[in-house]
C-alpha cells in the first residue's frame, strides 16, 4: 500500500507511515503528505537543509537513504515497482531562497526496472516551474557516482554530484549539492531546475511526490 491507500483507510495526518508493495512483505518507511492537493501523496524525495549527503552509490539509491521526516530518497526499486502497478502522477514542489514556490506536475510517471537502470518516463507537464520539462525527455537512465549511464563524456553524477536521470548532463538535478543562502548562485553542481530558476541557481527546498492518477 502507498500513502493514497493509507489516506483512504482513514489516516489523514501528515507523517511517516510504513508502506508495502502488493504481493510483498517488504516494508519501507515513507513520509505521507495528507494535506496538499487532497492528500494521499507518497514523498519520494525531499531536500530542505543539507543534512543528508546525496552523493550516494547505485545500491543506496536503489534501496533509499536518509530520514523520512527530513531529507531522504525513498528508493528507486520501491518506486519502480509501485509505479508499474498502476498509473501515477508526479508532483515536484520547489522553493527558492527568496520565498517563492513553484511546482511541476506530470500526469503520468513511472520508472523502468533496474534492468534499464530505473529509466524515467514522464508525460503531460503542467505547473508553474516552467513550460518545458526540466527532466530531459524522452527520459534517461538513472546515474550515480559509481554508475555512469549518462550521455556525457564528463560523468555527470561525479561532476554535478548526486544520483539523477542525467542526459548530457541536462536541465535538472534535484539531488545536487545543497548550498546555503547567499552561496546558492553560480553553482553548476547545486540543486537545479533550469526552466524555473536557470542554470546556476541552487534551490532551498524540493519535494518529489507521487499519487495514483485515479485518486
Amino acid at each position: 500500500r502507498d500513502c493514497a491507500e493509507v489516506f483512504k483507510s482513514g489516516h489523514t495526518t501528515n507523517g511517516v507511515y510504513t508502506l508495502t508493495l502488493p504481493n510483498s512483505t517488504e516494508e519501507v518507511k515513507a513520509y505521507c503528505d495528507m494535506e496538499a492537493g487532497g492528500g494521499g501523496w507518497t514523498i519520494i524525495q525531499r531536500r530542505e537543509d543539507g543534512s543528508v549527503d546525496f552523493q550516494r552509490t547505485w545500491k543506496e539509491y536503489k534501496v533509499g537513504f536518509g530520514n523520512p521526516s527530513g531529507e531522504y530518497w525513498l528508493g528507486n526499486e520501491f518506486v519502480s515497482q509501485l509505479t508499474n502497478q498502476q498509473r501515477y502522477v508526479l508532483k515536484i514542489h520547489l522553493k527558492d531562497w527568496e520565498g517563492n514556490e513553484a511546482y511541476s506536475l506530470y500526469e503520468h510517471f513511472y520508472l523502468s526496472s533496474e534492468e534499464l537502470n530505473y529509466r524515467i518516463h514522464l508525460k503531460g507537464l503542467t505547473g508553474t516551474a516552467g513550460k518545458i520539462s526540466s527532466i530531459s525527455q524522452p527520459g534517461n537512465d538513472f546515474s550515480t557516482k559509481d554508475a555512469d549511464n549518462d550521455k556525457c563524456i564528463c560523468k555527470c553524477s561525479q561532476m554535478l554530484t548526486g544520483g539523477w536521470w542525467f542526459d548530457a548532463c541536462g536541465p535538472s538535478n534535484l539531488n545536487g549539492m545543497y548550498y546555503p543562502q547567499r552561496q546558492n548562485t553560480n553553482k553548476f553542481n547545486g540543486i537545479k531546475w533550469y526552466y524555473w530558476k536557470g542554470s546556476g541557481y541552487s534551490l532551498k527546498g524540493t519535494t518529489m511526490m507521487i499519487r495514483p492518477a485515479d485518486f
Epitope: 547505485w58 533496474e114 534492468e115 534499464l116 537502470n117 524522452p138 534517461n140 537512465d141 559509481d146 554508475a147 555512469d148 549511464n149 549518462d150 550521455k151 556525457c152 548530457a168
Partner: antibody, heavy 120, light 107 residues
Framework: QVQLVESGGDVVQPGRSLRLSCAAS????????MHWVRQAPGKGLEWVAI????????YYADSVKGRFTISRDNSKNTLYLQMNSLRVEDTAVYSC?????????????WGQGTLVTVSS | DIQMTQSPSSLSASVGDRVTITCRAS??????LAWFQQKPGKAPKSLIY???NLQSGVPSQFSGSGSGTDYTLTISSLQPEDFATYYC?????????FGQGTRLEIK
C-alpha cells in the same frame, strides 16, 4: 592497459556443454559490468549476455536463455560463460567485452575471442 | 527486438575521402547508440557511444550524429588504417542489437 583474454573454446557435439573463461587485467574488474558477444563465421555481431559488476543482475539474449549462464569471480578477475545444450547455430567466436560502467549496456574494451564449434 | 539497419553494406573509398555510414533503428532509441570498428581477425574497437561521444583514444576524424531512429558515423578524412568493417549498436533496451555491418574498402 586493459586486457581481456578468452579461453575454453573447443569443438563439441550438439547437446554437450562447454565453459568459457575471460581473464581480465589492467583495471578494477569488480567495478565494471561484463558482457559476452559472439560472431558466427562470416556473420555480424550478436550480444549474448551481461552480468553486473557485483553479479547481482544477469540478462540474456532469447537465443541462449535457459541454456547459457554468465557468472564472475571478482576475486579471480575472471568472467565465465557456462554453455549447456549446445546447438550447431551456437558456432561462433565468443568475445568478452567490458561494460562502460556497471550496467550501461555499451562496451569500451573487447577481447580477441575464442572459437566454439558445435558439430556432429 | 529492435532491428538496426546499416547502409551501405559495403563502400569503396580513397584515402582522404569523407565517408558517411548510416544506421536506422526500427524504433526510436533516444541516442542510445554506439559505433565499433572491426578489422579481420581482430577484436572490435569501440569508437563512439551515446551517438556522438568519442571513446578515449579515438582520433578526431571520427564523429557521430543523429536522433530518434536515424544515426550517422562520419569519417572526415580517411586514413589507411580506417579501412575496416563498422557496426552500430543500440543499447536502448534489451536485447542489445547490432547493425549488420558496413565494409569499408580501398578504392
Amino acid at each position: 592497459q586493459v586486457q581481456l583474454v578468452e579461453s575454453g573454446g573447443d569443438v563439441v557435439q550438439p547437446g554437450r556443454s562447454l565453459r568459457l573463461s575471460c581473464a581480465a587485467s589492467g583495471f578494477t574488474f569488480s567495478s565494471y559490468g561484463m558482457h559476452w558477444v559472439r560472431q558466427a563465421p562470416g556473420k555480424g555481431l550478436e550480444w549474448v549476455a551481461i552480468i553486473w559488476y557485483d553479479g547481482s543482475n544477469k540478462y540474456y539474449a532469447d537465443s541462449v536463455k535457459g541454456r547459457f549462464t554468465i557468472s564472475r569471480d571478482n576475486s579471480k578477475n575472471t568472467l565465465y560463460l557456462q554453455m549447456n545444450s549446445l546447438r550447431v547455430e551456437d558456432t561462433a567466436v565468443y568475445s568478452c567485452a567490458r561494460d562502460f560502467s556497471i550496467s550501461s549496456r555499451h562496451f569500451d574494451y573487447w577481447g580477441q575471442g575464442t572459437l566454439v564449434t558445435v558439430s556432429s | 527486438d529492435i532491428q538496426m539497419t546499416q547502409s551501405p553494406s559495403s563502400l569503396s573509398a580513397s584515402v582522404g575521402d569523407r565517408v558517411t555510414i548510416t544506421c536506422r533503428a526500427s524504433q526510436a532509441i533516444n541516442n542510445y547508440l554506439a559505433w565499433f570498428q572491426q578489422k579481420p581477425g581482430k577484436a572490435p574497437k569501440s569508437l563512439i557511444y551515446a551517438t556522438s561521444n568519442l571513446q578515449s583514444g579515438v582520433p578526431s576524424q571520427f564523429s557521430g550524429s543523429g536522433s530518434g531512429t536515424d544515426y550517422t558515423l562520419t569519417i572526415s578524412s580517411l586514413q589507411p588504417e580506417d579501412f575496416a568493417t563498422y557496426y552500430c549498436q543500440q543499447y536502448y533496451i534489451y536485447p542489445i542489437t547490432f547493425g549488420q555491418g558496413t565494409r569499408l574498402e580501398i578504392k
